[in-house]
């Protein structure tokens, strides 16, 4: 167990635990002091005790040693009075540190006493060699436990120069492959540096003679070290391992090194000492096996080979940890090592070995694990696991310690948890104590909560309800007990209801530049606080203060002016602080395709053929397949700025090959269509020109016609430039009478026409035209039939007669007039016809002619829309393209027809049952007026009841109908009659019912001049007359409030004028009607331009 | 009279990038494109891409394609030609030319800008 | 890429002499080839193109021939202004390759 810092006011005891000690091997120089450290923790205070070798050491009671007075060392010096005084302390220590809890226990300490370093007293004899032999000076400094650093150097101090021929070994010795005479010297020292003690010691000068020779001999190379074929050595694993092969021989030897088992790790190896010394860094199982060194020279080679071994000393596998019990646990102490040899292990208890301790221990040791079951506090103790082999020991100490704790409930109570419906609530109830207390969860009712399934509890008190119920809303009781005590807190859960999203955003697909709405409808917990907010792609949108792109409100996302861009799932995120929902949909934005990026010409060498080959990049194609490419062309010099399109091709298909024309500055475009329409165009091509050729078309709609009586106008379309196949074309204009066979005239022009002169009226000719450049001619063109000038027709169309149709329309026919008198091509007749008047009366009026063009090939006409019983003018003439010819006259009258509607009925109500009709005659007679007819029948009778009669004064300009119901509307009709019956009616609706109830004065109004007042209104169409008083009363003190005696009006009258009225006076207007008040208004008269002086009482400024 | 004027002669290090120039006068610089073509010593001649400097739509050959960029300045009527990660085989007469009006022919050459690359 | 090979790579004639100068496209171009005079230290010229069409200002005794892979530059009377190195290009297809050159020297 672990004590959680939350759980306080619990003083636990520690047991020691070794915080620093010395190293395992102390090496002490003659004039060092000795220290020993020794330093732990614990609570209660530590004790400490050492041994040495085995036996109980107290430093106290030996001379000159000082015991550091701290509460948590165990630490003492020893100082020396004389220099060899170490030797008498060396040995292997260990500090024990013990408090009631247990004992933990240091490392062995190895204290070794190092002696000021001496060579021994030698006679070194002078060293004599032949010139080209090898020889070996020796060092062999004294022993140290410390390492030392070699130096050869001469009575001067200089280093001895070392390469491939003289080197220093590892041990020391200088070797020499060969000696040269410039080797002789007597003055070879070997310096020893012993770094602990910090003194340089130097050998006795070794004097190295060589002796010259005349011929030197070369040998083969032979090993100087090491001197036999093969060694084997142990490297230990994450140690350096360094192999070394000096050898001799002449010429001077070279080293190689191989390794026959493997792949040398060439990331760990480096070749040192001119490659005699090869060094492997950390060395690992992989490393194991032979390594060979190769000395070479011109005459043959020496080898030797290394078998390595690798070991290592122990190290953990699993190192015993230190814990806290609590009662009735099972502590396991892993103590898992390895090495090579495997170690050995073993264990102790406070410091004592176990196979020293009574049999009865609990205690049971299986596979390199100490176990003891169902602990209690009499089981506390610091435990220590040694491994040992041959290169080393390791050593930890792991206490086991059993601790009794009260209870505890470390989550604060009275929590409330809210969660919404369908969610997991997670109640805490973090609970400590040793044993560990077993927890509880209750309801109110104090029952378990666990046998609803949906209630499930956690390891580490928390109580889990999944698929949350509103009703599952109420108080929950956490109970934690042990053997000590037990503690309560109580949890209050509120559920919550969830959020729903109602209506989510619909993925949708819209065009580009247009906008698009989402909307979210969101049902939320009204207690909580609610959020809806928008994501696209995972992002968080937000409206930018700075651009107007994104708009959002109430629930909706607008994003306005869509891009491609703008593609993408948008969400909509419905949350509170309890929950978060999210619905997405998805947008699509479509549109025209983007630019084709790029444009290549190509078989630029078909422009002879006047073609080329377009390819093309596809375009995007923004969501809506591309259904095709149009290919357009420019010709700068042409047309700049005008594009035309030379086809389409399939939206899959990015080249084509070109029908050109020729001599045309080509530059090209590419334009991706899809169903929104077409996209940007590519960037231009190169322009490339065709080369020229004669015309491959001539000109159309050729036609001859004279402007004059003596010409012929010979005119065409001219081509249009693209057919012009070079820079200019001319036109060939041959003619000559038709019919002749004779030979033909012709001309060559620039201008799209040509005046043939001199010609006789109206002669027929036969005409070609064709396309001339400087490359040739257009094909043989198509022969027209053109004419010289026209001149007036001389024929006069004869009548045939006119049949009168009807009233308003007459058929005029006439006969075919002589072509041979047309003078030209007949076109047609013009017919001219004018009304000069009625039958009744002769007007004085602007006579206004109609025309009627009539084809060539038709000689009669229906002249309609005449006017009844009139008098007309007719000319007839033909006419060519010259003009018209002389005419031919008639003139014609048309009968009687019915008359046009009476003019402006109106409906005058005399009483509840009588009406007056009053009307205008018809604008058109259309003949002599005989009278009128008159029908009435009441509207809600659907027609039936229709009364009739006729009225036989044309004169006659009124009616009073008598007899009519009161409660009932009426539908009049009024038709004017001729010979030819009754004409087109005017209708009025009416009544006396809805006419006769309260008078209504309508749009009444009152003016003023100096002495009357003129009082208008306008009567209500059919209103029953009726009369009426108008009163007018001068208003004012001086007026007395003065009236003028009421005058009788009739409502039909429309105004009245009342005179004898003051100037500069207001007056009240009253209407009376059978002495009911029905109306007021007010007037002022005019002033007379005398200065009035104000009524008495008032003010003046 | 047309005319082509590119800047002076230039000595580069390995790995540097030049920029020749190329100023044009006598006729509407927007209306013929500007192509750029280079002479190694005692060598042919060798196209490299050019310009439509109505558009600023450029192409280049593949050899050159990520190493090449010619723009264009209107205003100033002046066609640019940008060689960067530049190599010893660059060492070269790099001419400005203006093609023909219809077809990929060299009508007009600027005088030619020697650059040396040399480290 | 079109290859365009001349040859021979240099000649040496005398004046008055008729010169011929052949080049070989490595495919079809149909007549789409230009040729081009470089005098020593200027700046190259364009003689024809459409294989056989003179370039304005060009004197009529330079002339040239041929389509698809096989093209001729003849001068008809050499003259010593006629020193120069000349080179064929073709136009049919990007990128735009010219030949390695045909070195021309009055004996």
């Known amino acids: 167990i672990q004590i959680p810092e939350e759980y306080e006011g619990h003083h636990v005891m520690e047991p020691p635990v070794i915080t620093e000690q010395s190293p395992r091997r102390l090496v002490v120089f003659p004039t060092d002091d000795i220290s020993l450290k020794c330093e732990a923790s614990g609570k209660p205070e530590v004790q400490f005790r050492w041994t040495r070798d085995g036996v109980h050491f107290k430093p106290k009671e030996e001379l000159g040693v000082t015991v550091y007075q701290s509460p948590h060392s165990g630490s003492f010096t020893i100082t020396g009075n004389n220099s060899n005084f170490a030797q008498r302390f060396q040995g292997i220590y260990r500090c024990f540190a013990s408090n009631k809890l247990g004992t933990a226990m240091s490392h062995e300490i190895r204290l070794m006493a190092e002696g000021a370093p001496k060579w021994p007293k030698e006679t070194v004899k002078p060293v004599e060699v032949e010139e080209g032999e090898s020889v070996v000076l020796p060092c062999n400094p004294p022993p140290s436990a410390e390492p030392l650093r070699i130096y050869w150097m001469n009575s001067k101090i200089l280093h001895i120069k070392q390469d491939e021929r003289v080197t220093m070994g590892q041990n020391g010795n200088l070797y020499f492959a060969n000696v040269l005479t410039s080797d002789n010297h007597s003055d070879y020292i070997c310096h020893a540096h012993f770094p602990g003690t910090r003194t340089i010691i130097q050998k006795e000068p070794i004097d190295l003679r060589v002796k010259a020779t005349n011929s030197m001999i070369d040998r083969k190379p032979r090993l100087l070290f090491p001197t036999n074929s093969s060694s084997h050595l142990v490297a230990l694993q994450g140690q350096p391992l360094v192999l070394e092969c000096i050898a001799e021989g002449f010429p001077t030897p070279t080293i190689k090194w191989l390794r026959p088992s493997g792949p040398m790790p060439a990331d760990r190896v480096t070749y040192q000492n001119h490659n005699k010394t090869l060094q492997l860094l950390k060395v690992g199982e992989e490393d194991d096996g032979e390594y060979r060194c190769l000395a070479e020279n011109s005459l043959g080679s020496a080898r030797h080979a290394y078998y390595v071994t690798v070991e290592a000393a122990p190290y953990w596998l699993h190192k015993p940890q230190s814990h806290l019990y609590g009662p009735g646990e099972t502590a396991r102490l892993d103590c898992q090592v390895q090495g090579r040899p495997q170690p050995e292990v073993t264990w102790r208890i406070n410091g004592i070995p176990v196979e020293e301790l009574a049999k009865d221990q609990k205690y049971r040791i299986q596979r390199g694990a100490l176990i003891l079951s169902n602990v209690q506090p009499s089981d506390t103790m610091v435990t220590q696991c040694e491994a040992r082999n041959r290169h080393g020991l390791l050593l930890a100490n792991a206490y086991i310690y059993v601790v009794q704790l009260p209870a505890k409930i470390l989550t604060a109570d009275n929590q409330t948890y809210m969660a919404v419906q369908g969610s997991t609530a997670y109640l805490l109830c973090k609970a400590f104590g040793a044993p560990v207390p077993s927890v509880q969860w209750l309801d109110e009712d104090g029952t378990t909560v666990l046998q609803d399934e949906r209630f499930f509890p956690y390891a580490n008190g928390t109580l889990g309800i999944r698929d949350l119920q509103a009703n599952d809303t109420g108080r929950y009781f956490c109970l934690a007990a042990n053997d000590q005590n037990n503690v309560t807190i109580m949890a209050n859960l509120k559920v919550k209801d969830a959020t729903q999203i109602t209506q989510g955003p619909r993925s949708t697909i819209e065009k580009k530049g247009s906008r698009v709405t989402f909307t979210c409808q969101a049902s939320f917990d009204p207690s909580l606080q609610p959020s809806i907010t928008w994501r696209g792609d995972g992002r968080d949108l937000q409206e930018l203060g700075d651009s107007d792109k994104y708009f959002i409100e109430d629930g909706r996302l607008v994003i306005h002016s869509l891009d491609y861009s703008d593609q993408g799932n948008y969400s909509c995120v419905a949350s509170t602080e309890l929950d978060v929902v999210e619905s997405r949909a998805q947008l699509l934005v479509v549109g025209s395709p983007g630019p084709v990026p790029r444009l290549v010409l190509s078989d630029l060498h078909l422009l002879t053929q006047s073609q080329v080959r377009v390819s093309w990049s596809p375009a995007e194609d923004h969501n809506a397949p591309i259904e095709k490419y149009d290919i357009e062309f420019e010709d700068k010099e042409m047309a700049p700025e005008k594009w035309y399109s030379l086809g389409k091709v399939p939206g899959n298909q990015t080249s084509t090959t070109l029908k050109l024309s020729p001599y045309v500055h080509y530059t090209f475009r590419v334009t991706a269509i899809n169903k929104y329409g077409p996209g940007e165009p590519s960037p231009v091509s190169e322009t490339v020109v065709t080369p020229e050729a004669a015309p491959e078309k001539n000109p159309v709609d050729v036609k001859g016609e004279g402007n004059e009586t003596t010409n012929m106008v010979i005119t065409w379309k001219p081509l249009r430039w693209m057919d012009w196949n070079a820079p200019q074309v001319q036109y060939r204009v041959q003619w000559r009478p038709q019919g002749t066979r004779g030979p033909w005239q012709e001309q060559i022009v620039s201008d799209p026409f040509l005046v043939v002169s001199n010609t006789s009226t109206f002669v027929p000719y036969e005409i070609k035209v064709q396309a001339v450049n400087s490359q040739g001619k257009g094909p043989e063109p198509q022969v027209t039939i053109g004419y010289s000038g026209e001149d007036y027709p001389q024929a006069i169309p004869e009548l045939e007669g006119i049949e009168i149709l009807n009233s308003s329309a007459v058929l005029v026919k006439w006969r075919p007039v002589d072509l041979a008198q047309v003078k030209g091509h007949l076109r047609g007749y013009n017919v001219t016809y004018w009304r000069e008047g009625s039958q009744r009366k002769h007007s004085k009026r602007h006579i206004h002619k109609d025309h009627v063009v009539v084809p060539a090939n038709t000689t009669s006409v229906i002249l309609s829309g005449l006017r009844p019983y009139s008098s007309y003018h007719l000319e007839v003439q033909a006419f060519n393209g010259r003009g018209s010819g002389p005419a031919s006259e008639f003139t014609f009258s048309t009968p009687e027809g019915v008359p046009g509607h009476p003019e402006a009925l109106h409906l005058e109500c005399q009483s509840n049952t009588s009406l007056l009709l009053r009307w205008q005659p018809p604008l058109s007679h259309n003949g002599v007026l005989t009278g009128y007819v008159l029908s009435y029948h009441p509207l809600d009778e659907g027609g039936k009841g229709q009364l009739s009669f006729n009225l036989r004064d044309p004169e006659l300009r009124t009616h009073n109908l008598t007899d009519l119901s009161p409660h009932l509307r009426y539908r009049f009709q009024l038709q004017a009659t001729t010979k030819e019956g009754p004409g087109e009616a005017i209708v009025r609706e009416g009544g006396t019912m809805a006419l006769s109830g309260i008078s209504d004065f309508g749009n009444i109004s009152a003016t003023a001049g100096e002495n009357y007042s003129v009082v208008s209104w306008v009567p209500k169409e059919g209103q029953c007359n009726f009369r009426f008083h108008i009163l007018f009363k001068a208003l004012g003190e001086e007026k007395g409030g003065a009236s003028l005696s009421p005058q009788y009006v009739s409502y039909n009258q429309s105004s009245y004028t009342q005179w004898d009225l003051q100037p500069d006076t207001d007056y009240e207007i009253h209407l009376f009607k059978e002495r009911m008040f029905r109306h007021q208004m007010a007037v002022k008269t005019n002033g007379t331009g005398r200065v009035r002086l104000p009524p008495a009482g008032f003010a003046t400024e | 009279q047309v005319q082509l004027v590119q800047s002076g002669a230039e000595v580069k290090k390995p790995g540097s990038s030049v920029k020749v120039s190329c100023k044009a006068s006598?006729?509407?610089?927007?209306?013929?494109?500007i192509q750029w073509v280079r002479q190694a010593p005692g060598q042919g001649l060798e196209w490299m891409g050019y310009i439509n400097p109505s558009t600023y739509y450029s192409d280049y050959a593949q050899k050159f394609q990520g190493r090449v960029t010619i723009t264009a300045d209107e205003s100033t009527s002046t066609a640019y030609m940008e060689l960067s990660s530049l190599r010893s085989e660059d060492t070269a007469v790099y001419y400005c030319a203006r093609r023909q009006f219809g077809l990929p022919l060299f009508d007009y050459w600027g005088q030619g800008t020697t650059v040396t690359v040399s480290s | 890429d079109i290859q365009m090979t001349q040859s021979p790579s240099s000649l040496s004639a005398s004046v008055g002499d008729r010169v011929t100068i052949t080049c070989r496209a490595s495919q079809d171009v149909g007549t789409a080839v230009a040729w081009y005079q470089q005098k020593p230290g200027k700046v190259p010229k364009l003689l024809i193109y459409w294989a056989s069409t003179l370039h304005s200002g060009v004197p009529s005794r330079f002339s040239g021939s041929g389509s698809g892979t096989d093209f001729t530059l003849t001068i008809s009377s050499l003259q010593p202004e006629d020193v120069a190195t000349y080179y064929c290009q073709q136009y049919s297809n990007y990128p735009l390759t010219f030949g390695g050159g045909t070195k021309v020297e009055i004996k």
């Open positions: 006598g006729y509407t610089f927007t209306n013929y494109w």
